[in-house]
């Protein structure tokens, strides 16, 4: 991941705003604060982005290399099956859950985990780089 201009001025890492990190054609924001799932989603939308939707195992692996043990909200919910916010199914990874009330998804360096949507966690936003 290539850090944005707040952290680096390298010519090879342009085009993501301050606070954001670049990977491929996308910019990622890793929060410091914690919010519940819906508030994390609203934060991302208010910054013209989306709560993280992961497209494949490669992207997931790369992001997990950057994450710690702390879980971060992603744009994943259990609505008659685990689906990303754009409606696409989760089909490249399993998600660990130990309760039917855990209907929102979070990620850390090791796994995708279901959690109660009211829990306050850090989150990750994603948007197409300018």
């Amino acid at each position: 991941l290539c850090q944005g201009s707040k952290y680096s001025t390298c010519a090879s890492c342009p085009s993501c705003p301050d606070h954001w990190m670049k990977y491929g054609n996308h910019c990622y924001y890793f929060s410091v604060e914690k919010k519940d799932w819906i508030s994390s989603l609203e934060f991302c939308l208010a910054r013209d982005s989306h709560l993280l939707m992961i497209t494949d195992k490669q992207e997931m692996s790369l992001l997990q290399d950057f994450l710690s043990e702390a879980f971060h909200w992603v744009g994943l919910r259990n609505n008659s099956g685990w689906r990303w916010e754009d409606g696409s199914p989760l089909n490249f990874s399993r998600i660990y859950s130990n309760s039917l009330v855990q209907t929102c998804g979070a990620i850390n360096k090791n796994s995708l985990q279901a959690s109660s949507c009211e829990v306050s966690l850090q989150w990750v936003c994603k948007k197409v780089s300018p």
Partner: antibody
Amino acid sequence: QVQLVESGGGLVKPGGSLRLSCAASGFTFRNYAMSWIRQTPGKGLEWVATISESGNYNNYPDNVKGRLTISRDNAKNSLYLQMNSLKAEDTAVYYCVRDDWEGRAMDYWGQGTTVTVSS
Amino acid sequence: DIQMTQSPSSLSASVGDRVTITCRASRDIGSSLNWYQQKPGGAPKRLIYATSSLDSGVPKRFSGSGSGTDFTLTISSLQSEDFATYYCLQYASSPWTFGQGTKVEIK
């Protein structure tokens, strides 16, 4: 320094309309989500609307949805609140506020503009 | 919605006093709490964010603590310019909600 200056408040009859404006300066307006907060003697401080950096996304609490519309013009560094079908309970001081980038709610507030809904 | 209950609603104190204001959330909000100061006829000004971090330019006599559901704003030695109304705000869960305010008056 960050400055937010509201205008457009006044006396309006129930059912009427009003458009509030907020002129922003001292920061890169297009890089911040913005909100309106109102304050009444009865209900205290209450969030009423948020708009994304580009203006493509709006968010409202249920009690104002459909009556209040937030918008912005990044070329003019301006934020707006269109208020329709006004009710007596909309009487308040309305503040234009900047959202803290890291998600810690609002960091800077304007001085406010007063809206009075009365017949 | 999360309810924020502030206490006391008002208090009288003298210059130099130590003042403590508390805010209780109806459910766990972690450390997602701000404190604002509002003087008569003015706008709220953020003093503290994320429970305990002071905004730039805010005197060090102001401090915040707590986590989960119980939070405290402390003014270690009250000054004349501190007589105002103080509000807490939670931003862990949408919609953002404020406490009803604590008015700090001169004894």
